[in-house]
């Protein structure tokens, strides 16, 4: 039961950090227009992934994208491929994670095969996190590095003349999203993980194996030990792992009447 | 068609206060509304904003200590009170509604206050 | 707060003849995100209200004629008639729209010659 849980927690938390991170990836405000000690505007301006906009005390918001490929920055192309990896990873993490999710029974798929699949989505939402998390941190230094340098010359002369004032940018909201949607991934991931050690059919250290002793019919039960020479193995190739424990809803798997030496 | 109809001409004596209102017409009334204010031949000069939304507004520096703008939105009309009435506080009125460019648009036709005792 | 510059004070231009005013700002009015000045034109006609002619620096109003256009950039501006009308006798403002305090240029009184 707890397996479960663990298992269906895990997919709910990812499938939240999944949405958010898609959420984050199409906002606006990954960077907006500093209030702060600068001189106020009767315009708002706003940078996301994809288009910059501007917001006029008027109402009026005009959004202008990024048609151009070659003149981006390489940080911001840096970036859309992470958040955009992310996104990949975490959908087709959801999707295998749905087929592993011990609460649906698709055919005869057994433990192993939903467990190996439980790890795989586990680590692919792990990854996909920290994709998430990578990108806003590379786009939240490169404001801060920004954002000091235009501080410094916060003022540029014109010609000695004139005065213009440089626009600053500071965190928007997506970077906010990204973090705790990045963070969500990485910890459903995790405990998809978990759960996949649960979820693993283990060797147990009394296996019924059948011995035919000559003239008579004896059914002979070893216990104590784990052969390594083929007595107690897995005798339908499921795949083993070690320490996880064993819960109510878990099936033993016990030889079959064919397993006779 | 918009329209921003003001209140009448005010006479006030000096020290006193002046509230004018401003009532809109097939007017958006989500946008900031403006004050202009203009002197005898003179140019003119902004006021101050307040957005009919959220009744937030924005003064200007010169005049902050002394107006005042509120609404009421059941009857879409912002008001503009001035306070501490001088004799150079003699001037026109004028409400102003937001359009693109932070420009304004839509005017209302002015209300002359003139601070005499 | 910013400073708007209007030349000349007065003008006087023969019907049918170019007029052109100047506004020079204290500041630079180009807004970067969208690459647009927020500079506005105004008419004023003795004892109404301005009316709005041009917003974003060159954006004529719908209904204003076409022989009103506005050009310039950052702190320049200019507001040309091409062809001077009866009608055009006013005085001009221009308006920054961009920093608060919003401020309004002196004023430019056109006159017929």
């Known amino acids: 039961m707890a397996v479960t849980a663990c298992q269906g927690l895990g997919f709910v938390v990812s499938l939240i950090g999944i949405a958010g991170i898609i959420a984050a990836t199409c906002m606006d405000q990954w960077s907006t227009q500093d209030l702060y000690n600068n001189p106020v505007t009767a315009v708002f301006n706003y940078q996301g992934l994809w288009r910059s906009c501007v917001r006029e005390s008027s109402g009026f918001t005009e959004c202008r994208g990024y048609f151009t490929l070659l003149g981006l920055p390489a940080m911001l192309q840096a970036v859309r491929a992470l958040m955009i990896v992310g996104i990949v990873l975490g959908a087709i993490g959801l999707l295998v994670s749905i087929f592993a999710l011990k609460c649906i029974r698709i055919g005869s798929m057994e433990d192993s095969a939903k467990a190996n699949m439980t790890l795989t989505s586990g680590i692919m939402f792990i990854v996909s996190g920290l994709c998430a998390i990578a990108g806003v941190s590379v786009f939240a230094n490169m404001l801060v590095t920004n954002f000091w340098m235009s501080t410094a010359n916060m003022y540029t002369g014109m010609g000695g003349m004139v005065q213009t004032v440089q626009t600053r940018y500071t965190f928007g909201a997506a970077l906010f999203v990204g973090w705790v949607a990045g963070g969500l991934t990485l910890i459903g991931g995790v405990m998809m993980c978990i759960a996949c050690r649960g979820l693993a059919p283990e060797e147990t250290n009394y296996k019924a194996v059948s011995y035919h002793a000559s003239g008579h019919s004896v059914a002979y039960k070893p216990g104590g030990f784990k052969a390594s020479t083929g007595f107690g193995s897995n005798t339908k190739n499921k795949k083993i792992y070690d320490g996880g424990a064993r819960t109510e809803d878990e099936v033993q798997s016990y030889p079959s009447k064919h397993d006779y030496v | 068609q918009v329209q921003l109809v003001q209140s009448g001409a005010e006479v006030v004596k000096p020290g006193a206060s002046v509230k004018v209102s401003c009532k809109a017409s097939g007017y958006t009334f989500t946008n900031w509304v403006h004050w202009v204010i203009q002197a005898p031949g003179q140019g003119l000069e902004w006021m101050g904003e307040i957005n009919p939304t959220n009744a937030r507004s924005n003064y200007n520096e010169k005049f902050k200590k002394r107006v005042t703008m509120t609404l009421d939105r059941s009857t879409s009309t912002v008001y503009m009170e001035l306070s501490s009435l001088r004799s150079e506080d003699t001037a026109v009125y004028f409400c102003?509604?937001?359009?693109?460019?932070?420009?304004?648009?839509?005017w209302g036709q002015g209300t002359l206050v003139t601070v005499s005792s | 707060d910013i400073v708007m510059t209007q030349s000349p004070d007065s003008l006087a231009v023969s019907l049918g003849e170019r007029a052109t005013i100047n506004c020079k700002s204290s500041?630079?009015?180009?807004?970067?995100?969208?690459?647009?000045?927020?500079l506005t034109w105004y008419q004023q006609k003795p004892g109404q209200p301005p009316k709005l002619l041009i917003y974003?620096?060159?954006t004529r109003e719908s209904g204003v004629p076409d022989r009103f256009s506005g050009s310039g950039s950052g702190t320049d501006f200019t507001l040309t008639i091409s062809s001077l009308q009866a009608e055009d006798v006013a005085v001009y403002h221009c308006q920054n729209n961009y920093y608060y305090p919003l401020t309004f240029g002196g004023g430019t009184k056109l006159e017929i010659k």
């Open positions: 500041q630079s009015l180009l807004n970067a995100g969208n690459q647009k000045n927020y």
């Open positions: 974003w620096s060159s």
């Open positions: 102003a509604g937001i359009y693109y460019g932070n420009s304004f648009a839509h």
